[in-house]
Interface confidence: low
Amino acid sequence: VPRWRQQWSGPGTTKRFPETVLARCVKYTEIHPEMRHVDCQSVWDAFKGAFISKHPCNITEEDYQPLMKLGTQTVPCNKILLWSRIKDLAHQFTQVQRDMFTLEDTLLGYLADDLTWCGEFNTSKINYQSCPDWRKDCSNNPVSVFWKTVSRRFAEAACDVVHVMLNGSRSKIFDKNSTFGSVEVHNLQPEKVQTLEAWVIHGGREDSRDLCQDPTIKELESIISKRNIQFSCKNIYRPDKFLQCVKNPEDSSCTSEI
């Protein structure tokens, strides 16, 4: 008789999850010499240990501490790029501007990017059928707690000028409920961070509005200023040209507004 299994509202664990995490770890440590010392089997064991046999609505940051310890990594603190609702462009940017880093350019972010996972209380099984949805089921689920933990640590590590890419096509350009708005903003360290510089990415080709005047951006500015961090904002009117100019800075068109 098959055991009764909790049905959650969200999609189940990504297929071949253990193999994917292990393969990503091996690939990352091969590409990044400073992480060559990492034992990927230990990383997987620590990852697994954070959620296996635990109720998937009762995960804590503490559960991830062994994984955090194994994945400790130093990135240049003044070259951090945060993003909100515009992941693809942020990643395209750091693929070209190799000295800047998003969270997903670090080992732990790379391992978990676009994956879903959860277990079941009191069994060693991974649940491939369903996992808790943040809104409909519970916020303390394995995926949400993981991203909250690594995002907090990433923001805490930042210094000098921190950049954030925001999606100017969304109704809330800055969303207080996003990971950026709820975690990263509040964990930037004022004693280390001079300025948060927002890049608002425009969607429409003919959109010449100054989205830095958007009420949600003003809200972000207010939150940041109250934390004794300077704020600045720039419109990126042509994201295609922006990327092109990062790739080919000598292009004569790159001295004009992007």
Epitope: N78, V161, T195, E197, W199, C233, P249, E250
Partner: nanobody, 121 residues
Framework: EVQLVESGGGLVQAGGSLRLSCAIS???????MGWFRQAPGKEREFQAG????????YYADSVKGRFTISRDNTKNTLYLQMNSLKPEDTAIYYC???????????????WGQGTQVTVAS
């Protein structure tokens, strides 16, 4: 490769103004730029910085309210407007590009040759 050429230095009376320029040639898409100065017998020190992307500006306490850094991307030029000059502002002024940390004079990818500013009392 980036070349930086400063101009605009010279002799000026105390209380006067000067505008320094730094012409940038070569690779122009560089993150942070700044102005530094070195007085005789002293270390080179940060005066003002600006980020390429957003144009955020930073100043040493000694020049806040008197100096203004700006840049014109269309002319590939960095500027330093210096007002209310004092004799202690006398120094060689250097333009720097690709600052690793704004305010840290030891780490920049590119430096100009410098331009002399002398403020007479």
């Amino acid at each position: 490769e980036v070349q930086l050429v400063e101009s605009g230095g010279g002799l000026v009376q105390a209380g006067g103004s000067l505008r320094l320029s730094c012409a940038i040639s070569g690779r122009t898409f560089i993150a942070d730029m700044g102005w530094f100065r070195q007085a005789p017998g002293k270390e080179r020190e940060f005066q003002a910085g600006i980020t390429w992307f957003g144009g955020s500006t930073y100043y040493a306490d000694s020049v806040k309210g008197r100096f203004t850094i700006s840049r014109d991307n269309t002319k590939n030029t960095l500027y330093l407007q210096m007002n209310s000059l004092k004799p202690e502002d006398t120094a060689i002024y250097y333009c720097a590009a690709g600052l690793k940390r704004i305010g840290d004079q030891r780490e920049a990818d590119y430096w100009g040759q410098g331009t002399q500013v002398t403020v007479a009392s």
